[in-house]
Interface confidence: low
């Protein structure tokens, strides 16, 4: 699935503070980290709001809409289902058919003002800048642009060495200085970013079969 299917609301969800990623957690227990990004409940709400289906949006259509918005539905399948159940139980969505995560869903008009915010925002009062389209009825889900900004993130991750077939060269822009260390070392050394190393090592490339969809 890709971002092709028109569906998701044209606008991006209201801004919110990105959850701080705990890198250590992953290292330690090997448990997968929680994906960052807006709660899926927001994306679901907006996708449902953007739909013109009178009878509600089916789970399949919803996934298509989320994929069109760039959300990795395969990776986050269970999160989508949980989000749906949660939104129904909160009254943000009404289930028009079926039970559980299957069936069809509509926005509960009483609960949803133009900009439904199912999740609790972190302090810092990000206000929902212009409704992202909840009330909008895009003929096509348009691609919401988003800025390159802000690094309010944890320090940049040490970059894994790019494929062996590549020769890494000196940095083009300092912000991207990368740690050219093996993955493991790189993790712990994430902060000690090496200054542009100039010796490009050309590694004999191995042919990789292109991953085609």
């Amino acid at each position: 699935m890709s971002e092709t299917a028109p569906a998701a609301p044209a606008a991006a969800p209201p801004a919110e503070k990105a959850p701080v990623k705990k890198k250590a957690a992953k290292k330690a227990g090997g448990t997968p980290r929680k994906a960052s990004g807006p709660p899926v409940s927001e994306l679901i709400t907006k996708a449902v709001a953007a739909s013109k289906e009178r009878s509600g949006v089916s789970l399949a259509a919803l996934k298509k809409a989320l994929a069109a918005a760039g959300y990795d539905v395969e990776k986050n399948n269970s999160r989508i289902k949980l989000g749906l159940k949660s939104l129904v139980s909160k009254g943000t969505l009404v289930q028009t058919k079926g039970t559980g995560a299957s069936g069809s869903f509509k926005l509960n008009k009483k609960a949803a003002s133009g900009e439904a915010k199912p999740k609790v925002k972190k302090a810092g009062g990000t206000k929902p800048k212009k409704p992202v389209g909840a009330a909008k009825k895009p003929k096509k889900a348009a691609g919401g642009a988003t800025p390159k900004k802000s690094a309010k993130k944890t320090p940049k991750k040490a970059k894994k060495p790019a494929a062996a077939t590549v020769t890494k060269k000196v940095a083009k822009s300092p912000k991207k200085a990368k740690v050219a260390k093996p993955k493991k070392a790189a993790k712990s050394a994430a902060k000690a970013v090496k200054p542009k190393a100039a010796k490009p090592k050309v590694v004999k490339p191995k042919k990789a079969a292109p991953k085609k969809k």
Epitope: S2, A10, G37, P38, A68, D72, K130, G143, T146
Partner: antibody, heavy 117, light 108 residues
């Protein structure tokens, strides 16, 4: 074939407002999509400035938000960028593009705007 | 600074395979898009979504994603593939677009 064309002054004085317009042909802005502005300072990378949906909802790069205004004129099938209080750091090639979320599939050829007195 | 990190420069021998990577927390939830930019030209979308190529883009270009890393692979690099490559995606808040710093690909 969707085409976008930026237009506007190539030279702007410091502290003034940079104004650019993007004319869209081959696709009706009111049919959907986001319409965005991206810039690229000489020798540097791409920076998203902001985007607007045909309905008028806008999304801006937080680092530029206080100075940016993007508007759309569906009757003329064009959208515009205004960047106030410019400095030399705003010198860049400015691109307009059509987007679906963060995927920009059609771009204008870009217009160089130099900020200098 | 950018929320998406790319290697500044990478080289590949003509006809060989090269992989350009892009890292960022938001890539755990969102697919990256990849753009090719040649000197003096506007960027061109080469890969988007899970692994989709716009029409006109050669099938030697492919995309993949794992964890917080997205990759653009060029299998059998050609001289004309020499260019700057940028990844972009939504940021972690989901509300903004971010671009990686770009990777300059040199075909030897």
């Amino acid at each position: 074939q969707v085409q976008l064309q930026e237009s506007g002054p190539g030279l702007v004085k410091p502290s003034e407002t940079l104004s650019l317009t993007c004319a869209v042909s081959g696709y009706s802005i009111s049919s959907g999509y986001y319409w965005g502005w991206i810039r690229q300072p000489p020798g540097k990378g791409l920076e998203w400035i902001g985007s607007i949906y045909h309905s008028g909802s806008t999304y801006y790069n937080p680092s530029l938000k206080s100075r940016v205004t993007i508007s759309v004129d569906t009757s003329k099938n064009q959208f515009s960028l205004k960047l106030s209080s410019v400095t030399a750091a705003d010198t860049a090639v400015y691109y307009c593009a059509r987007g679906k979320w963060s995927k920009f599939d059609y771009w204008g050829q870009g217009t160089l705007v130099t900020v200098s007195s | 600074s950018s929320e998406l990190t790319q290697d500044p420069a990478v080289s590949v021998a003509l006809g060989q395979t090269v992989r350009i990577t892009c890292q960022g927390d938001s890539l755990r939830s969102y697919y990256a898009s990849w753009y090719q930019q040649k000197p003096g030209q506007a960027p061109v979308l080469v890969i988007y979504g899970k692994n989709n190529r716009p029409s006109g883009i050669p099938d030697r270009f492919s995309g993949s994603s794992s964890g917080n890393t997205a990759s653009l692979t060029i299998t059998g690099a050609q001289a004309e593939d020499e260019a700057d490559y940028y990844c972009n995606s939504r940021d972690s808040s989901g509300n903004h677009v971010v671009f990686g710093g770009g990777t300059k690909l040199t075909v030897l």
